[in-house]
């Protein structure tokens, strides 16, 4: 990996449980200023596989509030506006970090966590199986 | 919101920078024990609207790796294997949470970062600009 | 060879039309998408319009929409541009590019060029 | 409509990096391509896909593509590299190839 020369101005780390333990501070800094927000926001109705967006909530978690898809149809939409089951609707999912309270509760007090979400769906060629 | 009962086992917060500043066990905790992670380890091949991964590397950031999807093409892929500029490959973003090391090059302080990722591509319907 | 030759240019008056024709040798014509871009005297590029290989899709610049009509003919080996309601503004050097297999974002043989110019 | 900005000028010392900027909003997430056109010439293509080289093209042209800019480097700038530089994408919302306005590399 590479190595980084370590910063002198480094809060003291003379903890038995570090390096598990860090500090965080949660004033979040958002990278994304010159995007805009409208642009991918219908893509969930005008995909050949649409989904639905569904929400998922958890006081314990951070952010406490997540937004699942899940594919409306099993095939994927065609030329004519009909679902065409030569092909398939499949979610892309990731996984992604999340806080969660240990021990639960506390409000300064977190574990990362990796959860995999379901982003969206594309629209696949389906693997077929000989049957012999 | 939510409220919820202080455990009273949590650590102590009688910090002047609480509730900004919290503590957090990097001992990552995986919740996708029975997912299959060759699932959707093709889609991006099999997908009528392809994309290709991009390592994103940065060693001030957790987690240092991010992969990002690109859309191979303008149109999507027709049942002949061919580009189709009547549909427009897309790329589906998310917002994600990563820590950055605050101060730089610090091993154990960290600062909460929202990036916006492009986690694979979808197929949609373009909307149709008319010229006067 | 590998080339694209493009032919057709000339001076014409406004509101007048022109036809392009290119003629691609040394290479399977028929499994690339082309397209034709623009330069203006003194000017940088720009892209006109696109045609998939088999000529089902095509896509056009918003300033040329409406006026402009792409086509090819596999057979001959020929990309073709159509260009009625010719402006002032329309004058330039139009090249002929093909699609590179690996993507649109990317033109991986150009023509020679040819003028067109648009004046009364 | 997406817009692709580029210096109009960078000069360079024979021998010395030359490096040629291409802004566009949040285009880490477009793949970028390279032109090069000498005087009186066709477009070349030079780089594809932000960082590929066609065959035939030196290895002294190199690209990359991350945040809002895309890069073209030459390294051990020639003479003979003196051109006018233009980049592409396209652009989903206006189903549209965009280049910039191009950049006319000098070599002193």
């Known amino acids: 990996g590479i190595t980084i020369p370590r910063n002198p101005g480094c809060p003291n780390s003379e903890d038995k449980n570090f390096p598990r333990t860090v500090m965080v501070n949660l004033n979040i800094h958002n990278r994304n200023t010159n995007t805009n927000p409208k642009r991918s926001s219908d893509y969930y109705n005008r995909s050949t596989s649409p989904w639905n967006l569904h929400r998922n909530e958890d006081p314990e978690r951070y952010p406490s509030v997540i937004w699942e898809a899940k594919c409306r149809h099993l095939g994927c939409i065609n030329a004519d506006g009909n679902v065409d089951y030569h092909m398939n609707s499949v979610p892309i999912q990731q996984e992604i970090l999340v806080l969660r309270r240990e021990p639960p509760h506390c409000p300064n007090s977190f574990r990362l966590e990796k959860i995999l979400v379901s982003v969206g769906c594309t629209c696949v060629t389906p693997i077929v199986h000989h049957v012999a | 919101g939510i409220t919820i009962p202080r455990n009273p086992g949590c650590p102590n917060s009688e910090d002047k920078n609480f509730p900004r500043t919290v503590m957090v066990n990097l001992n990552i905790h995986n919740r996708n024990t029975n997912t299959n992670p060759k699932r959707s380890s093709d889609y991006y091949n099999r997908s009528t609207s392809p994309w290709n991964l991009h390592r994103n590397e940065d060693p001030e950031r957790y987690p240092s790796v991010i992969w990002e999807a690109k859309c191979r093409h303008l149109g999507c892929i027709n049942a002949d294997g061919n580009v189709d500029y009547h549909m427009n490959s897309v790329p589906i973003q998310q917002e994600i949470l990563v820590l950055r090391r605050e101060p730089p090059h610090c091993p154990n302080s960290f600062r909460l970062e929202k990036i916006l990722v492009s986690v694979g591509c979808t197929c949609v319907t373009p909307i149709v600009h008319h010229v006067a | 060879q590998v080339q694209l030759v493009e032919s057709g240019g000339g001076v014409v008056q406004p509101g007048r039309s022109l036809r392009l024709s290119c003629a691609a040798s040394?290479?399977?014509?028929?499994?690339?998408?082309m397209h034709w871009v623009r330069q203006a005297p003194g000017k940088g590029l720009e892209w006109v319009t696109l045609?998939?290989?088999?000529?089902?899709?095509?896509l056009y610049g918003d300033s040329v929409k409406g006026r402009f009509t792409i086509s090819r003919d596999n057979s001959k080996n020929s990309l073709y541009l159509q260009m009625n309601s010719l402006r002032a503004e329309d004058t330039a050097v139009y090249y002929c590019?093909?699609?590179?297999?690996?993507?649109?974002?990317?033109?991986?043989?150009w023509g020679q060029g040819t003028l067109v110019t648009v004046s009364s | 409509s997406y817009e692709l900005t580029q210096p109009p000028s960078v000069s360079v010392s024979p021998g010395q990096t030359a490096s040629i900027t291409c802004s566009g909003d949040?285009?880490?997430?477009?793949?970028v391509s390279w032109y090069q056109q000498k005087p009186g010439q066709s477009p070349v293509l030079v780089i594809y896909q932000d960082t590929r080289r066609p065959s035939g093209i030196p290895e002294r042209f190199s690209g990359s593509n991350s945040g809002n800019t895309a890069t073209l480097t030459i390294s051990g700038t020639q003479a003979m590299d003196e051109a006018d530089y233009y980049c592409?994408?396209?652009?989903?919302?206006?189903?549209?190839?965009?280049f910039g306005g191009g950049t006319k590399l000098t070599v002193l």
């Open positions: 590019a093909r699609g590179s297999v690996r993507g649109e974002a990317a033109f991986d043989l």
């Open positions: 949040n285009l880490r997430t477009k793949y």
């Open positions: 040394g290479f399977a014509f028929g499994s690339y998408t």
């Open positions: 592409m994408t396209w652009d989903v919302d206006t189903t549209s190839m965009i």
């Open positions: 045609i998939s290989f088999d000529g089902r899709s095509k």
